[in-house]
């Protein structure tokens, strides 16, 4: 999103109009406490969508904060929006009006809070005061937001100066309740485990003496009840812990644990749940496909992923051509098996400036004592191709023959083409296309050899011209997957005695 | 959704070898993991081997590792298990079995396909 002016703050005279612009490659909108005021929104012929917002007889009441974001957030990336303050100086509108719920501000514990006086011009000195008091509490500013900081029970007023008149704000009143609220929370040793191990679960409260726990899970159902034990950390003040263990699982302990926790003092409770996998035998599952075959380009770094789940946690190693690979200590290559969640992993294997010589049969294979994976593919280097040679002769037989030799990864594909017009070629004319069966004057013989030690191939084509009667550009373009090489050469008939 | 046929089965001498194969109807076999499982009477199923939706992934289990061989033919929508150097222990109920939730696994609960089952019997 691109707004002009840019801000991310602007300072307009009252009574002025002011033009706002946003622009972005979807359907854009201005937004003004919530609300699309009147815009004019356009689309581009280069595909670009903007939105217009004409401020007209600014007053201080126009201050604030205008944003603009995406019309329709669906399928982006991303859910962008650009903030914009302006202030409208205004000496008749002394301090923003709050909505009646905006003076009246609850805590439930002590935390930063913000008492959102405003006013409308930037330069003013603005004070926070006890309602019943004239001293100036040391809190810090914003002119854009208010006073931030932590408060007392108490009523606050906003007092300002403007030209020779005091200002005060509506009062504003902080409430700290009172809530011993119940937090719970939930956690286990492991949430998958194999059949005969144990399972092992937590319950935590914060903040309370007198709790009581419930658990549920899948044996209560069947009426196979476990004894949960609680305890008090005794490191951490109103910490209470019931935990609960099943030794020796069973495939039907699978599902859900709830922890529910009361506190009968004023009947607060809250619950959390987990879920346990309990599965017959360790295993491995690949969450995505690595194609058989993958490229990487002859210089460059390329990185192959490969993401997985398994239990117990496995040991990764990666072979190329049944051999196995560590890190190089040249740098040449770097491999590593992160954990990225309890049983998920992602292995990587970084080839740094790729030779020829690693292309091959690479292999990552991840085991433990119960299951395995082996996962295969073939990495090819790709060559960008380059035109080695470009030569023209004249045998006996009267016609002239132009060859051409290159190299490349994947097979390079040849294009001949010839420019007769030398001045006005190839700037003003398209140069032919030649060796087309249809073209009686030209023959075309391309022979492809496949290089085992370079794994490349190399392609040569011979051009027969049949009768050149004036100066001609022969041109020889190669072209794979990865790049393209040209080399021209000018052709002269037999009779001319020179060469250009 | 997919079928799942298996064949091969069979008597077989101790030392010998044998091919199980597993026919899938459906048109979209190429989006499905397989794998070869086993049963005898009064366990568990147990895994055998499996293999990745193009091929590119294998696995075996420890019992069967180095004597096996899975591989599929995406073009016949088949899958194969080629035993060899059967040992009695390799007597059991083979199940061939297919997940669309994983390009790989060797979980039994991650299948979601499974087969009639064929009946492999190593004998002295």
């Known amino acids: 999103l691109v707004v002009t002016p840019p801000g991310p703050e602007l300072v307009l005279n009252v009574s002025s109009t002011f033009v706002l612009t946003c622009s972005g490659s979807a359907p854009v909108v201005w937004e003004r406490m919530s609300q699309e005021p009147p815009q004019e929104m356009a689309k581009a012929q280069d595909g670009t969508f903007s939105s217009v917002l004409t401020l007209t007889n600014l007053t201080g009441l126009d201050t604030g904060e205008y944003f603009c974001t995406h019309n329709d957030s669906r399928g982006l990336e991303t859910d962008e929006r650009k903030r914009l303050y302006i202030f409208v100086p205004d000496p008749t509108v002394g301090f923003l009006p709050n909505d009646a719920e905006e003076l009246f501000i609850f805590l439930t514990e002590i935390t930063e809070i913000t008492i959102p006086c405003r006013v409308t011009d930037p330069q003013l000195v603005v004070t926070l005061h006890e309602k019943k008091g004239d001293v100036a509490l040391p809190v810090p500013y914003d002119h854009q937001r208010g006073f931030s900081g932590i408060f007392e029970d108490r009523s606050y007023i906003c007092k300002t100066t403007i030209g020779d008149r005091e200002v005060d704000s509506d009062a504003y009143y902080v409430y700290r309740l009172q809530v011993s609220s119940i937090n719970v929370s939930v956690n286990a040793v492991q949430t998958v485990v194999r059949q005969g191990e144990n399972i092992t679960l937590m319950c935590i409260v914060i903040g309370n003496e007198v709790v009581n726990f419930e658990w549920t899970y899948p044996r209560k159902e069947s009426g196979r009840l476990v004894e949960p034990v609680t305890d008090f950390l005794l490191d951490m003040p109103y910490h209470i812990r019931s935990i609960l263990h099943i030794p020796s699982a069973e495939l039907e302990d699978s599902g859900t644990y709830t922890c529910n926790v009361t506190e009968s003092v004023n009947d607060h409770q809250d619950e959390k749940a987990i879920n346990i996998t309990v599965v017959e035998s360790g295993y491995v599952r690949l969450l995505g496909e690595v194609g058989t075959l993958q490229f990487a380009e002859l210089h460059r770094s390329r990185t192959l992923q490969v993401v997985f789940e398994a239990y117990p946690p496995p040991t990764v190693l990666w072979f190329k051509d049944n051999r196995t690979l560590g890190d190089s200590s040249a740098g040449e290559i770097a491999l590593s098996t992160r954990n990225v969640s309890e049983t998920r992993y992602v292995s990587e294997l970084t080839l740094v400036r790729v030779k020829v010589a690693e292309a091959g049969h690479y292999t990552m294979r991840a085991f433990h004592e119960d299951a395995e994976v082996q996962l295969s593919f073939q990495l090819q280097i790709n060559v960008p191709v380059r035109v080695l040679e470009l030569s023209e002769s004249h045998p006996d037989s009267g016609e002239q023959t132009v060859r051409c030799r290159g190299r490349g990864m994947p097979q390079p594909n040849i294009i001949w083409s010839a420019c007769r017009d030398l001045k006005r070629c190839p700037r003003e004319l398209p140069p032919t296309l030649l060796g087309n069966s249809s073209e009686e004057e030209s023959q075309l013989e391309t022979n492809v050899t496949y290089w085992e030690e370079e794994q490349e191939f190399e392609v040569v084509s011979t051009l027969r011209l049949q009768h050149v009667d004036r100066p001609l550009s022969v041109r020889c373009t190669l072209r794979n997957a990865v790049g393209q090489d040209t080399q021209e050469v000018i052709v002269v008939p037999h009779s001319l005695p020179f060469k250009v | 959704e997919v079928q799942l046929v298996e064949s091969g089965g069979g008597l077989v001498q101790i030392g010998g070898s044998l091919r199980l194969s597993c026919a899938a109807s459906g048109r979209t076999f190429s989006s499905y993991a397989m794998g070869w499982f086993r049963q005898t009477p009064g366990k568990e199923r147990e895994f055998v081997a499996a293999?990745?939706?193009?091929?590119?992934?294998?696995g075996y289990a420890d019992s069967v590792k180095g004597r096996s061989t899975i591989s599929r033919d995406n073009a016949k929508n088949m899958v194969y298990l080629q035993m060899n150097s059967l040992k009695p222990e390799d007597t059991a109920v083979y199940y061939c079995?297919?997940?669309?939730?994983?390009?790989?696994?060797?979980?039994?609960?991650?299948?979601?396909?499974w087969g009639q089952g064929t009946q492999v019997t190593v004998s002295s």
């Open positions: 079995a297919a997940t669309n939730k994983f390009s790989y696994s060797t979980l039994r609960n991650d299948y979601n396909y």
């Open positions: 293999i990745g939706r193009n091929g590119g992934s294998i």
